[in-house]
């Protein structure tokens, strides 16, 4: 394993006041998967609701790099390649678990966190609100 | 904190052979306070590439229930509400982290695992392969 020198300001798991703390093996099962979504498929370009992928990097988080989708248009691309504003491009969101260093910069101490990420976009029929 | 008696069959974090292991505070912090992903949408029904959500359940994993999207059609829904097979409904996949007890039933020892889930579907222009 990797040994990292203990920072005296970082929490000690033996400390009774430290919240419910466990050991987590970071030797991830299923490493073979490809984390860059651009490499896995070109759906982001071929979709009728295309999106750009933005790199969200945070060294205090694990995983440190998360790719966030941003829909390119408010509308969707029609058969002629033009944007049709009668339809809407919307992000599909997913809640994911990440680990955040807590306190910051402590190599061996993390907190479990849930964050919301946009994975891609889909084209939907808009909800029309009828005025009474 | 909660103190749990150590099971002699569970790994010792001091063990030099134990893989890269960190302390994690499992009191989950939820950053999504204003954006509840569950509330977020009925896009699965309104999309031109609609999908059904299937339950993937594993009691030895956290989260125990993960919803998998399955596209309803091979094609996409056109303006008339019919399936257009000149376009393709495809799943958007996301790699997520889950926690698994390892060894099983050891209260203070977990392993991170990456799994690939389908979050929703999008409508794409098919790739046409021209025969030489």
């Amino acid at each position: 394993g990797i040994t990292i020198p203990r920072n005296p300001g970082c929490p000690n798991s033996e400390d009774k006041n430290f919240p419910r703390t466990v050991m987590v093996n970071l030797n991830i099962h299923n490493r073979n998967t490809n984390t860059n979504p651009k490499r896995s498929s070109d759906y982001y370009n071929r979709s009728t609701s295309p999106w750009n992928l933005h790199r969200n990097e945070d060294p205090e988080r694990y995983p440190s790099v998360i790719w966030e989708a941003q829909c390119r248009h408010l509308g969707c691309i029609n058969a002629d390649g033009n944007v049709d504003y009668h339809m809407n491009s919307v992000p599909i969101q997913q809640e994911i678990l990440v680990l955040r260093r807590e306190p910051p910069h402590c190599p061996n101490s993390f907190r479990l966190e849930k964050i919301l990420v946009s994975v891609g976009c889909t084209c939907v029929t808009p909800i029309v609100h009828h005025v009474q | 904190g909660i103190t749990i008696p150590r099971n002699p069959g569970c790994p010792n974090s001091e063990d030099k052979n134990f893989p890269r292991t960190v302390m994690v505070n499992l009191n989950i912090h939820n950053r999504n306070t204003n954006t509840n992903p569950k509330r977020s949408s009925d896009y699965y029904n309104r999309s031109t590439s609609p999908w059904n959500l299937h339950r993937n359940e594993d009691p030895e994993r956290y989260p125990s229930v993960i919803w998998e999207a399955q596209c309803r059609h091979l094609g996409c829904i056109n303006a008339d509400g019919n399936v257009d097979y000149h376009m393709n409904s495809v799943p958007i996949q996301q790699e997520i982290l889950v926690l698994r007890r390892e060894p099983p039933h050891c209260p203070n020892s977990f392993r991170l695992e990456k799994i690939l889930v389908s979050v929703g579907c999008t409508c794409v222009t098919p790739i046409v392969h021209h025969v030489q």
Epitope: P19, R20 | G1, R39, S64, V65, L99, H105
Partner: antibody, heavy 117, light 106 residues
Framework: QVQLVQSGAEVKKPGSSVKVSCKAS????????ISWVRQAPGQGLEWMGS????????NYAQKFQGRVTITADESTSTAYMELSSLRSEDTAVYYC??????????WGQGTLVTVSS | DIQMTQSPSSVSASVGDRVTITCRAS??????LNWYQQKPGKAPKLLIY???SLQSGVPSRFSGSGSGTDFTLTISSLQPEDFATYYC????????FGQGTKVEIK
């Protein structure tokens, strides 16, 4: 098959506290949450809060915040719900339920708590 | 909190009847809606989760539909053991239940 077995009926005085237990038999808690739901006589169901025993993470309904404490002891696969400052309107059947964070699929048999002077 | 409103509050029906119960959410909850059956003196039992998925072991005469704010539980052919109170519950946010619909013998 997961079974949730709750402690017996309680009669309490106003202002006191009650602690109800819920033991998971036929398996560990696994990674699910345990929620507590109550039902006053002849009334509907009201969610009080939950705990993920694996983690010790709790979530309470705003109405009960500060008055309810949910804990879990993994070594005995038992969850507890303690309600303090009891008043007559807390008279209800209290249920524990296995909670996937999407639905409640297994329920305890219920514990009747009567608050009376 | 998200309010859940069920209608009707009670319904009288005979064995073999088709029974429909509706549930309306005060705001959009996507498909995060469940239906439970409760008999007197017993704990609730999960029938339908995620608006339309039948929980294992539940007879196929029970079905659920809807999305957003309006949902329906249908019992296609009422059986003697179906006389009970039915509750809808949202889990889009902290869980809340409808006030219940009692299905009684006509």
């Amino acid at each position: 098959q997961v079974q949730l077995v709750q402690s017996g009926a309680e009669v309490k005085k106003p202002g006191s506290s009650v602690k109800v237990s819920c033991k998971a038999s036929g398996g560990t808690f696994s990674s699910y949450a345990i929620s507590w739901v109550r039902q006053a006589p002849g009334q509907g169901l009201e969610w009080m809060g939950s705990i993920i025993p694996w983690f010790g993470t709790t979530n309470y309904a705003q109405k009960f915040q500060g008055r309810v404490t949910i804990t879990a002891d993994e070594s005995t696969s038992t969850a507890y719900m303690e309600l303090s400052s009891l008043r007559s309107e807390d008279t209800a059947v209290y249920y524990c339920a296995r909670d996937s964070e999407y639905y409640f699929d297994h329920w305890g048999q219920g514990t009747l708590v009567t608050v009376s002077s | 909190d998200i309010q859940m409103t069920q209608s009707p509050s009670s319904v009288s029906a005979s064995v073999g009847d088709r029974v429909t119960i509706t549930c309306r959410a005060s705001q959009g909850i996507s498909n995060w809606l469940n239906w439970y059956q409760q008999k007197p003196g017993k704990a609730p039992k999960l029938l339908i989760y995620a608006a339309s998925s039948l929980q294992s072991g539940v007879p196929s005469r029970f079905s659920g539909s809807g999305s957003g704010t309006d949902f329906t539980l249908t019992i296609s052919s009422l059986q003697p053991e179906d006389f009970a109170t039915y509750y809808c519950q949202q889990y889009s946010d902290d869980p809340t239940f409808g006030q219940g619909t009692k299905v009684e013998i006509k």
